[in-house]
Interface confidence: low
């Protein structure tokens, strides 16, 4: 409520992020030809990626390209990399689409399928759609803790959203528990009108909002949290313009004194928090 | 388990003839869908890259060294691949070994890194005289 009287200040916030989930991941993978189902068991380690300032990352999908060492080979089977002859192939053409560098010969890539040969991390990276069902599709049961502490120096206030006493096996819910900083990350989703398992497959960015409306004066103090969540990525992008959110690692190894990587494609949710509100005192 | 048995290795004069074979048995190893390729190892020289054939469309690839010289060639049916050494040189001297990848997706197709193949022979001896 604005106060005429008061002086308002912005508030300058620090925020710090705990994930906690198991997923089991049934991952289909072909061995000696066979296809095998294989499960393993996905913790925090292996989920959530460091991130720069106020974001964390939860991974919900991915593409494996394993084995990968830098040789020669054939590109993998696009419009572009299509070739019948050496001639539709340029040495030392790097294509920004490509994964590598062009030698100038057309090679047998599988059956009658000829392609440009590059040198690069070997084998290509397949193009292939995002697993359906997303693989760890259970990450709606994560959940995160928020950590929110915040600051008016100017009125020379500091607070947190995490008060001494407050039940830490809560869980977020907009009406019966408003205050809890533990937020179930399939909530966040039906909050904002959204179904996780959609925005699983290809990834997604969702905000997390946290307002802070305090009034400081002695008689009439209050300072606490509202929480809200809005959809950040455009659901609407068509697929030329690369809809949700991914991006590629790689795990290094070697084998027999050969650099190897397993290359891999994550799709996953990023999550911003973005701390506004401001801070009134006569 | 995989195995891979070279013959036809012998003493043979310089520009002569040879037909080195190799046979893959095992359960685990799908013939029809492997790289198969030859590599040799003269006495105090590193492995050296020969000739190898992709099992889709019989492509061939071979070393600078014996192009024109040397036809690879497979017989499905038989689990047999075969190279064939024309015009023979004293340097063509070594150990040649029979080599086979399997791969179970496209990609990988760097035929003379013997780090690609998965399975290798024992060697059979070739010796060139002048």
């Known amino acids: 409520s604005d106060k005429l009287y008061q002086r308002k200040e912005p508030v300058i916030s620090s925020v710090h992020t705990k994930v906690k989930g198991i997923a089991e991941v049934k991952e289909e993978i072909v061995e000696n030809g066979v296809k095998k189902l294989v499960h393993s068991v996905f913790d925090t380690a292996d989920y959530t990626f460091p991130l720069q300032g106020n974001s964390f990352f939860v991974m919900t999908n991915f593409l494996k390209t394993e084995g990968q060492e830098q040789r020669l080979c054939p590109e993998y089977p696009t419009r572009r990399t299509l070739c019948s002859s050496d001639r539709g192939c340029k040495k030392g053409w790097m294509d920004p689409q490509s994964k590598g560098i062009q030698t100038g010969r057309c090679v047998v890539y599988e059956g009658n399928q000829k392609t440009c040969e590059v040198s690069a991390w070997c084998p290509i990276e397949a193009v292939e759609e995002a697993p359906r069902p997303a693989l760890l599709n259970s990450a709606e049961n994560f959940t995160v803790l928020i950590k929110n502490n915040i600051d008016f120096p100017g009125h020379n206030y500091t607070t947190r959203n995490i008060l001494p006493g407050l039940n830490i096996t809560c869980t977020f819910h907009k009406t019966q528990n408003p205050q809890c900083p533990i937020f179930r990350l399939g909530d966040i989703f039906r909050e904002t009108g959204d179904n996780f398992s959609d925005v699983a497959i290809q990834g997604g960015i969702m905000g997390i909002e946290i307002y802070w409306d305090c009034n400081l004066d002695r008689w009439f103090h209050h300072c606490r949290p509202k929480y809200s969540f809005r959809r950040l990525d455009d659901k609407t992008t068509n697929v030329s313009l690369y809809p949700g959110y991914n991006f590629r690692y790689a795990k290094y190894y070697k084998e027999n004194n050969v650099e190897k990587r397993t290359l891999i494609k994550v799709f996953g949710i990023r999550f911003d928090i973005l701390v506004f509100g401001t801070g009134g005192k006569f | 388990e995989v195995q891979l048995v070279e013959s036809g290795g012998k003493l043979v004069q310089a520009g002569g003839s040879l037909r080195l074979s190799c046979s893959a048995s095992g359960r685990t190893f799908s013939f029809s869908t492997s790289t198969m390729g030859w590599f040799r190892q003269a006495p105090g020289k590193e492995l050296e890259f020969v000739a190898a054939?992709?099992?889709?469309?019989?492509?061939?690839y071979y070393a600078d060294s014996v192009k024109g010289r040397f036809i690879i060639s497979r017989h499905n049916p038989r689990n047999s691949v075969y190279l064939q050494l024309n015009s023979l040189k004293p340097e063509d001297t070594a150990v040649y070994y029979c080599?086979?990848?399997?791969?179970?997706?496209?990609?990988?197709?760097?035929?003379?890194?013997?780090?690609?193949?998965?399975?290798w022979g024992q060697g059979t001896q070739v010796t060139v005289s002048s």
């Open positions: 054939i992709d099992w889709s469309d019989f492509n061939t």
């Open positions: 080599a086979a990848h399997s791969e179970t997706r496209g990609g990988t197709r760097y035929f003379d890194r013997p780090s690609l193949y998965n399975y």
